[in-house]
């Protein structure tokens, strides 16, 4: 049993980190392998995690980790019984993929302005919290040509768009995602999208 | 929100021990690591020793080696520092502080006195 | 006894700036990060500045920290009267398995 893609981690910078490998063939991730991990830190145990199938030779597993900083490094052993696979090192820090937003909502009853809101997925005692942008994906149902990103780049989880911009008497769809430069991330995943139909007055033409 | 509420304030005699305690509240209390830092009359801060409350482990500054201990009480998440054989130079304010590299969140900090 | 290194005292006047030195070695500021506390009379130590550079919510951004090789500093532009207090540095020794170190400590006096 050999390790064919040494193991990649990312991480939510806040309670756990993914990582993900391929072995040399068929593997029963979960009763073959175990990742044990441990922060390069005074008192800080070992932990061990139970990793997934992810595709015939893939594996997956997610690290939980309390209070992540900077500074934290860990070193990762991958065994398959008494056999150590693989050994690295995974900092946090430096491989950051933010959570997605939550709780996308578009309000439509402000006079011909659509607000756009959603949730920060970060707690404000998290570094990230004060640091992320985000990209609003909004797109026509009924024509895929009319797809637009819009950048937020202040901190307010809010978009307000004219309602004119988009097409009147046709359903958009909405999704939002995050990232920050502070750390160099990459992309969130985009959250689920929400659904509305866009319906405002035109201007009367003299 | 994060509180770390310390005992009151002490006076022993030479040769005696103290017990000073760190009720924490606010967050999950075995997910971070508790310190204790004194600081004498005008002098400044001196790192004495780290618990960590999720398995009780604990790593002492050289100094209070023998001298000091550590333990934590999960069940009412609180953390104790115990300093035996004290001398007049052990009068200090000690403080608990939350943190792993670096400490966010303080204690207000327990004057200890000791005088004969 | 420390091994980061602080000048005793600073002073300034209000409105202008000033800076704090750490100094320190290659087995402790040289391969960790520098953290910075305030603290002011009568109170516990506060955050200022961690991971050399970064500023935890609610601390203005007047302060600011950097850090070269295996020295520190703390900057405070717009010096206010309430920023009189003692500011020590911190970091860990990787000679010691990580035990957390302090600077001797600053008397920042506004005039």
């Known amino acids: 049993m050999k390790v064919l893609q040494e193991p990649t981690c990312v991480s939510d910078y806040m309670s756990i980190s993914t990582c993900e490998w391929k072995m040399n063939g068929p593997t029963n991730c979960s009763t073959e392998l175990r990742l044990l991990y441990q922060l390069v830190f005074l008192l800080s145990e070992a932990h061990t995690c139970i990793p997934e199938n992810n595709g015939g030779a893939g594996c997956v597993c997610h690290l939980l980790m309390d209070d992540v900083v900077s500074a934290d490094n860990y070193t990762l052993d991958l065994w398959a019984g008494q056999q150590l696979l693989w050994k690295g090192s995974f900092k946090p820090s430096e491989h950051v993929k933010p959570r997605a937003p939550g709780n996308l909502t578009v309000h439509t009853n402000v006079s011909d302005t659509l607000l756009l809101t959603w949730s920060n997925p970060y707690p404000p005692d998290n570094y990230l919290y004060n640091h992320l942008t985000y990209a609003v994906n909004i797109w026509s149902e009924n024509d895929p040509a009319d797809f637009r990103i819009y950048n937020v780049t202040y901190l307010e989880p809010s978009l307000r768009i004219a309602a004119s911009t988009l097409k009147s008497g046709i359903s958009y769809r909405a999704r939002v995602r995050a990232w920050a430069q502070c750390y160099n991330t990459t992309w969130s995943e985009w959250s689920p999208s929400t659904k509305w139909h866009n319906s405002y007055r035109e201007p009367f033409e003299q | 929100q994060v509180q770390l509420v310390q005992s009151g304030a002490e006076v022993k005699k030479p040769g005696a021990s103290v017990k000073v305690s760190c009720k924490a509240s606010?967050?999950?209390?075995?997910?971070?690591?508790m310190h204790w830092a004194r600081q004498a009359p005008g002098q400044g801060l001196e790192w004495m020793g780290i618990?960590?409350?999720?398995?009780?482990?604990?790593s002492y500054a050289q100094k209070f080696q023998g001298r000091v201990t550590m333990t934590r009480d999960t069940s009412t998440s609180t953390v104790y520092m115990e300093l035996s054989s004290l001398r007049s130079e052990d009068t200090a304010v000690y403080y608990c502080?939350?943190?792993?590299?670096?400490?966010?969140?303080w204690g207000k900090g327990t004057l200890v006195t000791v005088s004969s | 006894q420390s091994v980061l290194t602080q000048p005793p005292s600073v002073s300034a006047a209000p409105g202008q700036k000033v800076t704090i030195s750490c100094s320190g070695g290659?087995?402790?500021?040289?391969?960790?990060?520098v953290s910075w506390y305030q603290q002011l009379p009568g109170t516990a130590p506060k955050l200022l500045i961690y991971?050399?550079?970064k500023r935890p919510s609610g601390i203005p951004d007047r302060f600011s920290g950097s850090k070269s090789g295996t020295s520190a500093t703390l900057a405070i532009t717009g010096l206010q009267t309430g920023d009189e207090a003692d500011y020590y540095c911190?970091?860990?020794?990787?000679?010691?398995?990580?035990?957390?170190?302090f600077g001797t400590g600053t008397k920042l006096t506004v005039l």
């Open positions: 502080a939350r943190g792993k590299w670096w400490w966010q969140h």
């Open positions: 606010g967050y999950a209390f075995t997910s971070y690591y």
């Open positions: 618990i960590n409350p999720s398995g009780g482990s604990t």
């Open positions: 290659s087995s402790n500021i040289g391969n960790s990060y």
């Open positions: 991971d050399n550079n």
């Open positions: 911190g970091t860990w020794d990787t000679s010691t398995t990580y035990h957390p170190i």
